[in-house]
Structures are given as C-alpha cells and as structure tokens.
C-alpha cells in the first residue's frame, strides 16, 4: 500500500503503513433493489478514531471467531493476525476452524517502515453489522509483522476494500468484496461515515465511543445532509480520482492540475493524514501559513512533529482556513468542490503534560506517492463507493465536526476544461514497482 | 502591449436591455478564452459568460442564463456581450478578460484563470 504516515502504523512522522446539478440520491431509479434508502442494522457499526483506524467486526471460521477488522479503502488484502502477538487480545485460530483450507502459499508485504507476512487460505466469512450473508473468501493469517498492528487500538486485522489489482501476491487473489458481490445479491457497492471526535479519546472511549458506519451494499440518507456528487474512479486499482483545482480560503493555488494528482489522488480511509505530493504541500502550507499569520507557529507543527495547544475550549478555528479539492464530475466540462475545515485538518491529541489543553497534530503531511485523501478528508464527508458505476460520492457527513460559523461543503457545478488532462500517467515500467 | 478595452456600459431601466463590446488589441499569440466578469459593491468578481476564440464554445452563469449572450467578431477582435431583460441585481461593474494559453483543468468563469482584464464599464439597473 502506500508509502509515509499510513495506518495501520501510527501518524507520526515515522509512520509508515498505514454543467448540470447532479441529481440527488433519491431522485434516481434503484439499479437494484435495497440499494438506497435504510440500513438501520449496518448504521453505527464502525469504532475508533483517525489516528488509529477505524474498525468493524467480523466473524471468520466454524464456529464463527469474532475479531475487530480494520477498514482499509487503500489495499486489498483481507488479513488478520494469526498468532499470537504482545498488542492483540486475540487472533484467528485456523486450527480451530472446521471450515479452513489452505491455499499453501505464502505472503509478505512489506511497508517503508515495518510489514506483515502470512500464510494464504480461505474460510467463512460474515459481518454481524453488515449483510445477512455469509461467504467464503481469501484470507492472509498473518504469522509475522513489524510495526503493523497498534498498542491500543483494538484491531486485530485489516479489510483491504480496493481492486484486485493491487491485492498481494498477485492481482489472482480476490479481494474480499468482490466475494462478496459474486457469491451473494449484495450490490456492488459500500460507502463510509468515519466520524472524527473532535477531540481526544481514550482507550475506555474508543471503546464505548461510536466511530462511524460502513453500509455494505447501499446507501444510508440518514448519514449526510445535502446532495452525493460524484466523482468518476478513474482506474480500479486503489480508489483513483482526479483532483482538477486545490483553493485554501478560496484562494487558488494556481499550480497545473497535474501537479495535484502526481502520480495519483486515491482515497484512502488507511491513511490518517491528507497527503500531498511535495509541491502541493509546500504551496498549500504556505498558504495555511499566510491565512493563519496571526499566531506563529514552530516550523515542527507544519511537520506534523510537534502539537500545539490551547486552554481547553479556546482553540482560534477562524485564523485557519478552509481546504477545498475540486474533483471532475460525472458530467462533461463540470467539477464540483469538497470543503474541508481545520476541525478535519488539526487532528485532536492527548497532551501527556496537561490534560487542561486542547492540542492537535497538523495532519497534512507531504507524500512521494501523489495525493492521498485519508481520514482527514473522510471524516468530512460520507463517502460512497460506487463499484458498480465505477465512481465515488461525496456528500457533507451528518456528524461531522464543525463550529457555528462554518460546515465542511460539497459544492457545485463549476464549469472546467480539459480535467482529463489533470490525470497522470504513470510508466508502465513504474508499476510493477509498487514497494509500498 | 496587450490592451482589453471595454465600452457600452450606462444605466438602464430593469427589462432594458444593453451591448458591451470588448475589443482586443496586442496580442501577439491567439487567446484561448475570453470571458466577461462583473463585481458589485462589496462583492466578489463573478464570471457572468465565457467564449473560446477558437471554436465559439460558450458557458454562463447560471443567474444570467437565457438572458445573456456572448459573441465574437474575429475580424474587429471584438468579443460582445448582449444583456437582455436586464434586473436591478446586475448593477456592476462589467470586465472582459482574456486567457491566452490552453491549460488542464480551466475553469472559464473563475477569475483567477485569467491574466489580462480590462478597465472595466459600469452597468446600472434601476427598478
């Protein structure tokens, strides 16, 4: 998976994995039945927080195991610790699945900093919070990893929910949703409302805390306000879009398209931080820097190094500013805009010294891989993945954080040329490189 | 040097109707887009229509469509913006701007596209 400040390893620097008005949802036909509309038993079915992911529960094996699954829109693999390990409170025991079969083969994935590798096999499959189905699909039981799994968080695996193509060993491993879509009437569709708190949790809180829902084969309308625009997936790989214009405070960064979208923008719900590729990052903290100058700052804030902290309840939200990514629409010539506030961008932390203040991480991090639209981004917005029509909704979350002056927006048409132009076009000697 | 000289603005009753010319003189390379702004009184500068100079290929604003009409003379290198069924709401200052170069990802009726702006004529519509 991706390069930099990637979850499942923390956000800290050293991280490493981790036109024509759109109509709205309810406007359309159904493409098949239950897509849209309630899903009351899926609703809330998703804990955690940004830092450290956000998980759902799953039972693998015979008799069914329950584990807490990390989910994970930026790889492919569906892989859970199978052996014993000093920070998971339990693990998938095969030897105690009547319903297991190995595949006798083996995977390794290493990451810029740490990895994981396992042994590949296939067992049952369900989600209590999700579909009524149950099925059958490929499953890595990791044996062995460094700097993977996270002290605290409470997940025990990871859902890899992108294309095949990016699934390890090879792009022959069926990806756990595509399983699911082929073995049972699930539509070919997810979407996602990761719910940011706003401000630190602790284990206990996380724990009692409701993180957010993924609706697997549907569409929730209780989970956003507004209307879902969409965004064509550009190419089924990891969830690739492409970014045409990037504004801070509504001013344009004025920098080629391109540039945005070197050497791709996925979205990314495995990633904490918004990443940008060098120049983009530079130019946009510059930016930040610029509307924010009423308070200075130390050079290792901007780094994502170092915290600052205000009494509590008296963090300056005014002297940030928006961020807003515009994305090519699904009409010709049209793009629409997602605004995002510093409530998504200042990530919430505990201050070991001092539980008085309120402190945050600038979670905007640079990245050598092109753009990635993490937690930051998502916590903004319900998200839908729309396998089927091969694009990606976005709509204002109904629990997003917000003040009384602004809200996170999704806004548009807006009139733009030539966006095709804006994507990148990676070597195809480059690909087979993909050291994550 | 590149000039953008804008001319027919004046005041007007609401339902009246008035033709702003722009004409284009210096240009040394062909324009890609020229497009009329206006900016009302504590207000930001808005695009109100836009024309490729090459292809005629128009867009407006959704407040000004059915109403307005952009056209273009290439022999005069003039670019005409016809404002009918005129409401006190268009009251504005009106700028023609041009872009000369073709890049990914423009946006016709944002004004930070645009790197040569005119004068600017004064429009007011009284009720």
């Known amino acids: 998976t991706q390069h930099g400040i990637r979850l499942p390893l923390r956000s800290g620097l050293g991280g490493a994995p981790l036109g024509l008005r759109l109509p709205r949802e309810t406007d359309e036909e159904p493409e098949e039945p239950g897509r849209r509309g309630s899903f009351v038993e899926m609703v809330d079915n998703l804990r955690g927080k940004s830092g450290q992911g956000y998980y759902v529960e799953m039972t693998v094996g015979s008799p069914p195991q329950t584990l807490n699954i990390l989910v994970d829109t930026g790889s492919s693999n569906f892989a859970v610790g199978a052996a014993p390990h000093p920070f998971l409170h339990r693990y998938y025991q095969r030897q105690l699945s009547s319903t297991y079969r190995d595949l006798r083969k083996g995977v390794y994935v290493p990451y810029t900093q740490g990895k994981w590798e396992g042994e590949l096999g296939t067992d049952l499959v369900s989600i209590p919070h999700g579909p009524n189905v149950t099925v059958r699909a490929n499953i890595a039981a990791i044996t062995e990893s460094d700097k993977f799994f996270i002290n605290g968080s409470n997940w025990e695996g990871i859902l890899g929910l992108a294309y095949a193509e990016i699934a390890r060993p090879d792009d022959s491993l069926e990806p756990f949703f595509d399983s699911l879509v082929k073995q049972t009437h699930v539509p070919n569709l997810f979407s996602l409302q990761l719910c940011g708190a706003g401000f630190p949790l602790n284990q206990s809180e996380v724990l009692a805390s409701v993180g957010g829902s993924m609706i697997i084969g549907g569409i929730d309308h209780s989970l956003y306000t507004g209307s879902l625009w969409y965004t064509p997936i550009r190419r089924e790989w990891y969830y690739e879009v492409i970014i045409v214009r990037v504004e801070i405070n509504g001013q344009d960064l004025k920098m080629d398209c391109k540039e945005y979208n070197y050497d791709k923008s996925i979205v990314d719900s495995g990633t904490t931080n918004l990443r940008l590729p060098k120049k983009v990052f530079e130019a946009a903290v510059k930016s930040i820097k610029a509307a924010s100058s009423t308070e200075k700052f130390p050079d290792g804030f901007w780094l994502g190094e170092q915290l600052v902290c205000w009494q509590a309840g008296t963090t300056p939200w005014n002297i940030f500013p928006v961020i807003s990514l515009y994305l090519m629409g699904e009409v010709t010539n049209q793009s629409f805009r997602i605004t995002i506030l510093p409530q998504q961008y200042l990530r919430p932390v505990e201050d070991v010294a001092t539980s008085q203040d309120d402190c945050y991480k600038f979670a905007i991090s640079q990245s050598s891989t092109g753009t990635v639209m993490g937690a930051v981004i998502m916590e903004g917005f319900y998200v839908v993945f729309d396998r089927a029509r091969k694009r990606i909704g976005f709509a204002v979350s109904a629990c997003h954080v917000h003040d009384e002056f602004r809200t996170a927006a999704v806004e548009g048409p807006f009139v733009t040329l030539d966006m095709e132009d804006c994507g990148y076009n990676i070597p195809q000697t480059d690909e087979s490189t993909l050291m994550t | 040097q590149v000039q953008l000289q804008e001319s027919g603005g004046g005041s007007v009753q609401a339902g009246g109707s008035l033709r702003l010319s722009c004409a284009a003189s210096g240009f040394t390379s062909s324009v890609y887009y020229i497009s009329w702004f206006r900016q009302a009184p504590g207000k930001e500068r808005e695009g109100v229509a836009a024309?490729?100079?090459?292809?005629?290929?128009?867009f407006y604003a959704d407040s000004v469509k059915g109403r307005f009409t952009i056209s273009q003379d290439n022999a005069k290198n003039t670019v005409y913006l016809q404002m009918n069924s005129l409401k006190p709401e268009d009251t504005a200052i009106y700028y023609c701007?041009?872009?000369?170069?073709?890049?990914?990802?423009?946006?016709?009726?944002?004004?930070?596209?645009?790197?040569?702006w005119g004068q600017g004529t004064q429009v007011t519509v009284s009720s």
């Open positions: 701007a041009a872009a000369l170069s073709r890049v990914p990802g423009f946006f016709p009726l944002f004004p930070s596209q645009y790197n040569y």
């Open positions: 024309i490729n100079s090459g292809g005629g290929i128009t």
